[in-house]
């Protein structure tokens, strides 16, 4: 009787695994086995394919090839028992295109509200990805094990922090790998669980800001109790693509190691021109809190990010402030290249209850004033796109005194 | 003083509506930017609607946009927000926020910015 050929072949890359599939044609036949070709694009010849020779299953596993993964190649494969089938040709294709990327190793670190996720691909040294493990990013889902709600977080690195969790409660997660260049989407990791820790005694610090004050970076925080130290410590912002890099080390700002207050000045050349990330820690002398969120500090929105400067035109009901561009060292106007918008506080001298207005134009009307009555203005930037979160400090306060009645015009 | 005293918030199928009210006092109501964030546990905070009162214009945020409505009514110095076809992840804390704006009334300026009531607790579940 004459052997058919198997057909249905099914080539499944994931990683560095190379995996192949098929349906035999007749499964009345028993004791067959099937032999895999293989021909490189511009080669007439065939060759056996190592790892696919007589194979009595319906799957076999070529990854021991050493291919060009960028290469086209071509497979056939064909029954065989006393005789042979005729070959059947599989379509050819390039492995780097057919390949998925497989789920990535998770390992996770419980604080009290927040978890650290340190991930690294699924396969080391991979031949797949040589050229692209720097260009990995990943995405996760999460939810609390109890209730089954589940939040997606999209583009993180190779370490990323979940905060605003909650103490002692388990939390479940699940990570997959994507090279956007390659419009590539992995497979999902096992679910890793995890239970938060019992809440610190110390919170960290909150609300870290950076400013610009004079040639010194002012960065202040808040923080809940009194009597205590803090340290801020800086990073590279790009090793967190790259947590590998035996770069990836947290280091001390100087002048912010064991402040006693919530602000450190330290002077603009401590960095050079890039995107860093900060953080701060507090401690009583016995305890330390866990480090607070890592804000994100690009040295040139941050030089830009002066106060504003604005004069004022005194109505008897109203005031009109035109704010201008901050002046640098010598006179000359900083240009903004970020579109800002502004926040004016002003209250009446006499009273320190505070009105504010928020503005995208550069020249406000601050209406419903009381005739001769003197007002204070202190205004401040802030970048309107929320993500880049940059704000100056006030400027100085300007106080005015309104006209008398009837001059509104 | 501002003073936003918000109302409406409960429990809810998945599908359902609510209706949120917001009165204002100690603040010029007219001319001026009013709307809605949301926070949920755990995480940031998100602007959900903003309407200026001196035209009536309103604004929304794209997670919402064809299912809720925000309105005012002057005579009463209220603004309302009308949730429809709600889902279990609009679950969240609804603040009624303000803030003095002409030319910035969006519900990012609410949410960062903005003078805010105690806030009224939305559940929806499936």
């Known amino acids: 009787k004459n052997l058919k050929s198997p057909q249905k072949v099914e080539v499944d890359i994931i990683d560095d695994n190379f995996i192949l599939r098929w349906n035999r044609s007749d499964e009345s036949v028993g004791n067959v086995t099937f032999s895999f070709d293989y021909q490189k694009t511009g080669m007439d010849n065939w060759i056996k394919l190592s790892g696919c020779q007589n194979i009595t299953s319906t799957k076999c596993n070529f990854s021991s090839l050493k291919l060009n993964v960028y290469e086209e190649i071509k497979l056939r494969i064909r029954a065989e028992k006393e005789n042979t089938s005729s070959w059947y040709e599989v379509d050819s294709f390039t492995p780097f295109r057919k390949a998925q990327i497989g789920p990535p190793e998770v390992h996770l670190e419980a604080e009290d509200k927040a978890i650290v996720i340190h991930i690294s691909p699924g396969t080391k040294d991979s031949v797949m990805w040589a050229l692209d493990g720097l260009s990995f990013t990943y995405s996760l889902v999460i939810w609390k094990n109890s209730s089954g709600v589940e939040e997606r977080i999209e583009n993180i690195y190779s370490r990323h922090k979940i905060y605003k969790l909650s103490p002692e409660t388990t939390y479940c997660l699940k990570v997959k790998a994507a090279l956007l260049t390659s419009w590539k989407i992995g497979v999902y990791s096992p679910v890793h669980c995890i239970k938060t820790t019992v809440e610190n005694e110390l919170p960290p610090p909150e609300n870290i800001e950076v400013s610009v004050q004079n040639q010194n970076y002012v960065l202040k925080w808040d923080y809940t109790y009194a009597n205590m130290t803090f340290q801020v410590q800086w990073l590279h912002a790009f090793l967190k693509r790259n947590p590998g890099n035996h770069l990836y080390k947290w280091k001390q700002i100087p002048d912010c190691e064991n402040v006693k207050t919530t602000q450190c000045v330290f002077p603009q050349n401590v960095f050079q021109k890039g995107i860093y990330l900060l953080r701060v820690q507090a401690s009583d002398g016995n305890n330390t809190s866990f480090w607070s969120e890592e804000i994100k500090f690009d040295t040139e929105i941050q030089a830009f990010l002066l106060p504003p400067v604005f004069n004022i035109r005194s109505l008897s009901d109203s005031f009109h402030i035109y704010i201008g561009a901050p002046k640098q060292s010598g006179n000359t106007p900083v240009i903004q290249d970020y579109p800002l918008i502004y926040e004016i506080i002003f209250w009446e001298n006499t009273s320190n209850a505070e009105r504010k207005i928020i503005e995208k134009k550069t020249d406000v009307t601050v209406p419903n004033l009381k005739p001769l009555t003197v007002y204070c203005v202190k205004a401040r930037a802030h970048t309107m796109d929320e993500k880049l979160n940059k704000s100056s400090v006030f400027s100085d306060a300007v106080c005015e005194k309104t006209k008398p009645g009837n001059t509104s015009k | 003083q501002v003073q936003l005293q918000e109302s409406g918030g409960g429990s809810v199928q998945a599908g359902g509506s609510l209706r949120l009210s917001c009165a204002s006092s100690?603040?010029?109501?007219?001319?001026?930017?009013m709307g809605w964030f949301r926070q949920a546990p755990g995480k940031e905070r998100e602007g959900v609607a903003a309407?200026?009162?001196?035209?009536?214009?309103?604004y929304y945020a794209d997670s919402v946009k064809g299912r809720f409505t925000t309105s005012q009514d002057n005579a009463k110095n209220t603004v309302y927000l009308q949730m429809n076809s709600l889902k279990p992840e609009d679950t969240a804390m609804y603040y009624c926020?303000?803030?003095?704006?002409?030319?910035?009334?969006?519900?990012?300026?609410?949410?960062?910015?903005?003078?805010r009531g105690q806030g009224t607790q939305v559940t929806v579940s499936s």
């Open positions: 926020a303000a803030v003095e704006s002409r030319t910035y009334c969006t519900p990012d300026a609410l949410k960062r910015f903005g003078y």
């Open positions: 100690g603040y010029t109501y007219s001319n001026n930017c």
């Open positions: 309407i200026y009162t001196g035209g009536g214009s309103t």
